[in-house]
Interface confidence: medium
C-alpha cells in the first residue's frame, strides 16, 4: 500500500459574498490492496480498503467579508495520519467520485 | 523513505484455494487509487445527513468472468478481466 | 499486454530541440512512475528522468546531465509519455528507452538520437 | 548519488559453468520498515532493450529462468546463473531503485567460450 499524507488545496466558499478562498492542507491520497472474491458469501462480505484518515484535527481559518458581510470563521478537518482502511460512512461520504478538494461554485478566488 | 509505486497493479493472478492442476480459477487482485478530503459545501448542502469528508475510491474489480462449478459444488467466479472501478464493501 | 513504443528519435544539430514520446497501452497509465533512460554507443545506461505516477502528482525529477535542458511530461488521456530535449550537445547521442515503474520492469524498444554537426 | 559498482567487468565462460557477478552500492538499499532491498538486475542482449531479471535483490520476475538468482542485502549484492546456457550471452546491469537519482552499475559482459 502506498496511502499517504499529501499537500493538497482546499477551496472554502464564502456563500454570501460568492467567492472562495484556497487554502494549503494535509489529506490522504494513495493505492490500497483489494481483492474481488471469485466465491462470494453474502453471509460474509469482504471489506474493501480506500485510503482515507486514521486520525484527523479541525482547524479553523477567518474568512474574509465583503459590502454587507462580516468577516467569518470556518472549521475544516485536517488529516494528520493515513492508512488504507474501511471508509466511516458516519463521518465520511463514501463515493466513487466527488467534486473535488478544490471545487468551487463560484468564479473568483481568493489566495 | 524509498522513492517508488510500489502497489502492484490490479492484474489477474491465480487463486490457490479453488484452482486445481490445470483448471486454474484466476482472481482480480492488486491497488488502485483512492483518496479523501474535506467535503466541499456544494457538496455538503446535498446531503440529507452531512458529512465533513470524502472520501473516493476504487477497487480492484472483475470487469468480466466466466461462472464455473468446481470442487466441492462450489460457484465461483472466474475472473477473465480487472479494472479499477466502484468498491461494494468498502463502507464500515 | 504492456507495451512501450518510442519515436521521434533522429539526427539533430547540436543547439537543437527534439521531442521524443512514448506510447503505453496495456495498464493504467496514471497509476505508475515512468522514466526514461538512455544509453549512449557501446556504453552503459543511464537514467535521466521521471514522472511520478498521479499519487504523487505527476511530479518529476531528473539527472544533473540534463536537468534545465529536458523537461518530461504525459498527456494522460491518451497515455503518453514526452521527453522535450532542449539545447542538444554530441554527449547527448544515445538510444533513449521509456520504461514503466521504478524497478523498470517494462522497456520500450528505444529511439535513437544523433546530435552532430 | 548512490554509486553503483560491478564486477567483474567482462567474464567469459563456458556452457554448463556456474558463475557470480557482483554489485555493491555505496549506501544501503535496505529499507528498514518492510525489509527489502531496492535493487534490480537486468540482462541486455546484443542489439536489444534491457530486460528485468530480479527485483527487491532477490525476487525473480515472472518468466525468468530459476537459473537466475539474486542475493546480497544492505550494500552487497550478487547474481548466480547456476548453469550457463549459450543465449545467456549479454551484459548484466545492477540498478538502484530507493532513490532518485536512478543509477544503474556499469555492467558485466557475459562471454561464451
Known amino acids: 500500500n502506498s496511502c499517504e499524507l499529501t499537500n493538497i488545496t482546499i477551496a472554502i466558499e464564502k456563500e454570501e459574498c460568492r467567492f472562495c478562498i484556497s487554502i494549503n492542507t494535509t489529506w490522504c491520497a494513495g493505492y490500497c490492496y483489494t481483492r474481488d472474491l471469485v466465491y462470494k458469501d453474502p453471509a460474509r462480505p469482504k471489506i474493501q480498503k480506500t485510503c482515507t484518515f486514521k486520525e484527523l484535527v479541525y482547524e479553523t481559518v477567518r474568512v474574509p467579508g465583503c459590502a454587507h458581510h462580516a468577516d467569518s470563521l470556518y472549521t475544516y478537518p485536517v488529516a494528520t495520519q493515513c492508512h488504507c482502511g474501511k471508509c466511516d460512512s458516519d463521518s465520511t461520504d463514501c463515493t466513487v467520485r466527488g467534486l473535488g478538494p478544490s471545487y468551487c461554485s463560484f468564479g473568483e478566488m481568493k489566495e | 523513505a524509498p522513492d517508488v509505486q510500489d502497489c502492484p497493479e490490479c492484474t489477474l493472478q491465480e487463486n490457490p484455494f479453488f484452482s486445481q492442476p490445470g483448471a486454474p480459477i484466476l482472481q482480480c487482485m492488486g491497488c488502485c487509487f483512492s483518496r479523501a478530503y474535506p467535503t466541499p459545501l456544494r457538496s455538503k448542502k446535498t446531503m440529507l445527513v452531512q458529512k465533513n469528508v470524502t472520501s473516493e475510491s476504487t477497487c480492484c474489480v472483475a470487469k468480466s468472468y466466466n461462472r464455473v462449478t468446481v470442487m466441492g459444488g462450489f460457484k465461483v467466479e472466474n475472473h477473465t478481466a480487472c479494472h479499477c472501478s466502484t468498491c461494494y464493501y468498502h463502507k464500515s | 499486454e504492456v507495451k512501450l513504443v518510442e519515436s521521434g528519435g533522429g539526427l539533430v544539430q547540436p543547439g537543437g530541440s527534439l521531442r521524443l514520446s512514448c506510447a503505453t497501452s496495456g495498464f493504467t497509465f496514471s497509476d505508475f512512475y515512468m522514466e526514461w533512460v538512455r544509453q549512449p554507443p557501446g556504453k552503459r545506461l543511464e537514467w535521466i528522468a521521471a514522472s511520478r505516477n498521479k499519487a504523487k502528482d505527476y511530479t518529476t525529477e531528473y539527472s544533473a546531465s540534463v536537468k534545465g535542458r529536458f523537461i518530461v511530461s504525459r498527456d494522460t488521456s491518451q497515455s503518453i509519455l514526452y521527453l522535450q530535449m532542449n539545447a542538444l550537445r554530441a554527449e547527448d547521442t544515445a538510444i533513449y528507452f521509456c520504461?514503466?515503474?521504478?524497478?523498470?520492469?517494462?522497456w520500450g524498444q528505444g529511439t535513437l538520437v544523433t546530435v552532430s554537426a | 548519488d548512490i554509486v553503483m559498482s560491478q564486477s567483474p567487468s567482462s567474464l567469459a565462460v563456458s556452457v554448463g559453468e556456474k558463475i557470480t557477478m557482483s554489485c555493491k552500492s555505496s549506501q544501503s538499499l535496505l529499507y528498514s520498515s518492510n525489509q527489502k532491498n531496492y535493487l534490480a538486475w537486468y540482462q541486455q542482449k546484443p542489439g536489444q532493450s534491457p530486460k528485468l531479471l530480479i527485483y527487491w535483490a532477490s525476487t525473480r520476475e515472472s518468466g525468468v529462468p530459476d537459473r537466475f538468482t539474486g542475493s546480497g542485502s544492505g550494500t552487497d549484492f550478487t547474481l548466480t546463473i547456476s548453469s550457463v546456457k549459450a543465449e545467456d550471452l549479454a551484459v548484466y546491469y545492477c540498478q538502484q531503485y530507493y532513490s532518485y537519482p536512478r543509477t544503474f552499475g556499469g555492467g558485466t559482459k557475459l562471454e561464451i567460450k
Open positions: 520504461a514503466r515503474d521504478a524497478r523498470f520492469a517494462y
